[in-house]
Interface confidence: medium
C-alpha cells in the first residue's frame, strides 16, 4: 500500500534570464527512495540515481544544476520554459510517487535585475 | 505588492549566533516555498538553505549543522537561525519565496563575522 506524499515548491512565476529552484520531499513512507527523476512534460530533464548518483540529459547540461538536495536548479529561463515539471520519486517496494510543479516563465523589461544565482 | 524584508544582521564574533527574519507580505497565499541566499562581496549570490511549507528542509554544505531554517506559515515569516558563525559567512543576506525568484530582491540584511 502507497502512504507516502509528495510537498513541491508549488506553482511558482519566474522572470526571463533568472534562476529558479524546483524541490520535492517524499514523507509518510518507509520506502527506500532509488531514484528520483525530473521531467519536463514529456522530456528527461536528470535523474539522480540512489547508486549512481546525477545525470542530466546533454541538451539542458547548460542550463540545469543538480540540487539542492534532489531538487534541480533551472537557470538562464527562458519563456519556452514554461510549463509543467514532474518530480517522478521511483522507490521500494512502494512504487512511483510523481509531485507536480508549474512555472511560468514571465517576460520583462527588468530582468536585468532578476534572480541569478549558484548552489554551492 | 509583493516585499520580502530581512532584518537581524549585524556584526557578531567568530562562533557567535544571529537570527535573520523575513517578513513576506503583499500575496494572497503563504508561499509553498522559502528560501535564504546570501552574497559575499565580490562573488556570487548563493542558495543557503530552503524551507516548504510543511517543514521540510535544505541546506548548503558549508552551514549544515550550524543553520537552521525555518517558517511560520501564520505570519508569512521566515527565519534563519545562524549559530557557530565565522568570518567566511560574512556576507548580505536575502530571503525569497516559491523557488527563488524574486524580482526586484529586497535590501537584504549584512552579517558581519569579525573579532
Known amino acids: 500500500m502507497m502512504t507516502g506524499t509528495i510537498e513541491t515548491t508549488g506553482n511558482i512565476s519566474a522572470e526571463k534570464g533568472g534562476s529558479i529552484i524546483l524541490q520535492c520531499h517524499l514523507s509518510s513512507t518507509t520506502a527506500q527512495v532509488t531514484q528520483v527523476n525530473w521531467e519536463q512534460q514529456d522530456q528527461l530533464l536528470a535523474i539522480c540515481n540512489a547508486d549512481l548518483g546525477w545525470h542530466i540529459s546533454p541538451s539542458f547540461k547548460d542550463r540545469v544544476a543538480p540540487g539542492p538536495g534532489l531538487g534541480l536548479t533551472l537557470q538562464s529561463l527562458t519563456v519556452n520554459d514554461t510549463g509543467e515539471y514532474f518530480c517522478i520519486y521511483h522507490t521500494y517496494p512502494d512504487g512511483t510517487y510523481t509531485g507536480r510543479i508549474f512555472l511560468e516563465v514571465l517576460e520583462s523589461s527588468v530582468a536585468e535585475h532578476g534572480a541569478r544565482f549558484q548552489i554551492p | 505588492e509583493v516585499q520580502l524584508v530581512e532584518s537581524g544582521g549585524g556584526l557578531v564574533q567568530p562562533g557567535g549566533s544571529l537570527r535573520l527574519s523575513c517578513a513576506a507580505s503583499?500575496?494572497?497565499?503563504?508561499?509553498?516555498?522559502m528560501g535564504w541566499f546570501r552574497q559575499a562581496p565580490g562573488k556570487e549570490r548563493e542558495w543557503v538553505a530552503s524551507?516548504?511549507?510543511?517543514?521540510?528542509?535544505w541546506y548548503a554544505d558549508s552551514v549544515k549543522g550550524r543553520f537552521t531554517i525555518s517558517a511560520d506559515n501564520s505570519k508569512n515569516t521566515a527565519y534563519l537561525q545562524m549559530n557557530s558563525l565565522k568570518p567566511e559567512d560574512t556576507a548580505v543576506y536575502y530571503c525569497?519565496?516559491?523557488?527563488?525568484?524574486?524580482?526586484?530582491w529586497g535590501q537584504g540584511t549584512l552579517v558581519t563575522v569579525s573579532s
Open positions: 525569497a519565496k516559491d523557488g527563488g525568484w524574486f524580482d526586484p
Open positions: 503583499g500575496f494572497t497565499f503563504s508561499p509553498s516555498w
Open positions: 524551507v516548504l511549507r510543511g517543514g521540510y528542509t
